[in-house]
């Protein structure tokens, strides 16, 4: 029943062009190129995409034409390597072009930059955007794909097509509205926030595949799909996992045409077989392709079947446990994970994976014994502390969030994480701690049964951002250790870190705490980031500062900004009051 077993095609590029259609083909090639060559100007990419598209059309007309039999990696890699400024713009990435496939593609993948040195995207005035949209809709939408793809080199390409479709719909509707801004801006904000979340979620999938291997990704997928489709048989879930793994392996590997094509096939298969998968798919399956795939990926968990038997019978009490384990270890562990996950939509995926790992470790030890059952009889008791740890952590942090509100909760996390890993760059600490803090408003509103899957799986996504950013410029052994030892134990590893006693406090630099009148014109969010940046720097200067000391300094700082932003001569106020504030803060913190 494999969805993806196709006849061999004489021309892969023709095959994908025909399957996807010209519009999607061009969009996906543009995304692929922008994700590889993140610094290239838009016009250069459009030119390359047009050349590839024209070539693909010749292959559609005659699959035996010259070069049409070449692999997509060969065709795309050859095209990328024609860029004249490759050496000047990308430095050693140009060396990739001296390699043969598949090494050349691997080389390009290794040079993808999670934090490219690109200017922040500034949103023009609504009228300016609407004019650009009306003047050349195609270019406007291509520009969107290009700008997102180059800043998010692991963005899930078929999902980016869905975002672009919504982006287009927003402009089509709102540029005709009476109040264009009121219509458009909330939609753009929503797309931006959803886009960042989507990018981060996909980045974790790619990290899982690339750093921990296919087995790790498949385990994650078994757990998640079993929670989502608890009525589906194990064989059905296994088939979906195999196909989903292929889709994500392709996208994470830069094979975006194959990925999009296979994702469409998977959506088709799921909808054709929804009776044996989930009762919640009906609405999704009535939608057009891009919406359908997105909807399936986000679909709510189906109801659990009634009267599921106890897990202990097959996995603890049965005399055949070790026999079944020996016969097919991964299948047996997969069945354990499936059975546990479908019964526990209230657990995070990472918790389910920790339980499965504990079960595996126990079987490895106990099945070597003369009396295995005596050894593993109490294995489920070992699960209790593993379940209670995230439950308690979430309870404590939700209480703190409810007490402080999002901004102050983020500040508490900023202090906590700066003390744990003070070597990490300030922008990274601010970005990651702000995102960690968003778990409060995202998850604490949920009832108990939904809190853990929401919170802990979200934290896994955010901590992966820390891991990929840190990997680019490693500065902390503790971060490296937590990021590389175990994918499912990253969060507990970071939670367990105490204050880094080996850290030598940063030298005090008054310039870091010098502010100007421009802070008054910033949005509330930007102003918060400025203040949080100062907070991280304070902790780096004085890691032993108490909560009370830091709170006092931050309150003074907030009052100082408010006062100077109301002053007639703002700049003079910032200069004079700023000096006083720095002096007072130094005294308060004993700097």
């Amino acid at each position: 029943r494999g969805v993806f077993r196709r006849d061999a095609h004489k021309s892969e590029v023709a095959h994908r062009f025909k399957d996807l259609g010209e519009e999607n083909f061009k969009a996906l090639v543009l995304i692929a190129f922008a994700q590889y060559l993140q610094q290239c100007p838009f016009e250069d990419h459009v030119k390359l995409v047009n050349e590839v598209t024209e070539f693909a059309k010749t292959c559609v007309a005659d699959e035996s034409a010259e070069n049409c039999d070449k692999s997509l990696h060969t065709l795309f890699g050859d095209k990328l390597c024609t860029v004249a400024t490759l050496r000047e713009t990308y430095g050693e990435m140009a060396d990739c072009c001296a390699k043969q496939e598949p090494e050349r593609n691997e080389c390009f993948l290794q040079h993808k930059d999670d934090n490219p040195n690109l200017p922040r995207l500034v949103r023009p005035e609504v009228d300016v955007m609407c004019t650009a949209f009306h003047d050349n809709e195609e270019t406007f939408l291509k520009k969107y794909l290009y700008e997102i793809a180059r800043r998010h080199p692991y963005f899930y390409a078929p999902e980016l097509l869905f975002f672009a479709k919504r982006y287009k719909a927003a402009f089509t509707e709102c540029c005709q509205a009476a109040d264009k801004a009121a219509c458009l801006l909330p939609k753009l904000d929503e797309l931006r926030d959803e886009g960042k979340a989507s990018s981060a979620k996909q980045r974790l999938k790619c990290a899982s595949l690339q750093k921990f291997g296919e087995r790790a990704f498949k385990a994650w997928a078994v757990a998640r799909l079993s929670q989502r489709f608890p009525k589906a048989e194990f064989a059905e879930v296994s088939k979906l996992v195999t196909d989903l793994t292929k889709v994500h392996t392709e996208c994470c590997h830069g094979d975006l045409l194959e990925c999009a094509d296979d994702r469409a096939d998977l959506a088709k298969y799921i909808c054709e077989n929804q009776d044996s998968i989930s009762s919640k798919l009906k609405e999704c399956c009535e939608k057009p392709l891009l919406e359908k795939s997105h909807c399936i990926a986000e679909v709510e968990n189906d109801e659990m079947p009634a009267d599921l038997p106890s897990l202990a019978a097959d996995f603890v009490e049965s005399k055949d446990v070790c026999k079944n384990y020996a016969e097919a270890k991964d299948v047996f562990l997969g069945m354990f994970l499936y059975e546990y996950a479908r019964r526990h939509p209230d657990y995070s995926v990472v918790l389910l994976l920790r339980l499965a790992k504990t079960y595996e470790t126990t079987l490895e030890k106990c099945c070597a014994a003369a009396d295995p059952h005596e050894c593993y009889a109490k294995v489920f008791d070992e699960f209790k502390p593993l379940v209670e740890e995230p439950q308690n952590l979430i309870k404590q942090n939700c209480e703190l969030f409810e007490q402080l509100g999002e901004y102050k909760f983020q500040n508490a996390l900023l202090v906590r994480y700066t003390k744990k890993v003070p070597q990490v760059s300030t922008p990274t600490l601010v970005e990651v701690s702000r995102n960690l803090g968003k778990v409060g408003s995202k998850c604490c509103k949920h009832p108990e049964a939904k809190r853990m899957p929401c919170a802990e799986d979200y934290l896994s996504v955010v901590l992966n951002q820390l891991c990929v950013l840190h990997e680019k410029t490693p500065v902390s052994d503790r971060v490296t250790k937590c990021c590389t030892e175990s994918l499912v134990n990253r969060r507990p590893c970071f939670s367990a870190l105490e204050v880094d006693e080996t850290y030598v406090p940063k030298e005090f630099n008054a310039e870091t705490f010098t502010f100007h009148a421009d802070i008054c014109t910033l949005s509330e969010k930007e102003r918060q980031i400025k203040k949080q940046t100062a907070l991280v720097e304070l902790v780096k200067h004085k890691p032993k500062a108490t909560k009370e000391q830091l709170k006092a300094v931050m309150d003074d700082f907030a009052a100082f900004v408010e006062k100077c932003c109301k002053a007639d001569d703002k700049e003079t106020c910032f200069a004079e009051e700023g000096k006083k504030l720095v002096a007072a803060s130094q005294a308060a913190l004993g700097l």
Epitope: A326, E327, C367, A368, A369
Partner: nanobody, 115 residues
Amino acid sequence: QVQLVESGGGLVQPGGSLRLSCAASGFTFGSFGMSWVRQAPGKGPEWVSAIDSGGGDTRYSDSVKGRFAISRDNAKKTLYLQMNSLKPEDTAAYYCTIGRSTSRGSQGTQVTVSS
């Protein structure tokens, strides 16, 4: 594909001896405890003896304690059962299993104790 192939059974007089072997393949033999199980005609399976993966810990049912000795050679992926002082009530099909399973995954080898 897990395969367990027993051999060494036969007809023996009461008080006699036999050595059964079980050749294993298709799994990491040296990582698993193993058992011998027997099934007499018309009866359910009966666990006889077990050994841990390293061969250091052996267990026996009361009915064979002091007469049977289980052992293994991990290099050869083979399990053994040395049966001494055999009695008519030891007559059964003997098969080896992984862990303490009593599920029959092989043909087994027939042991008949009769004068």
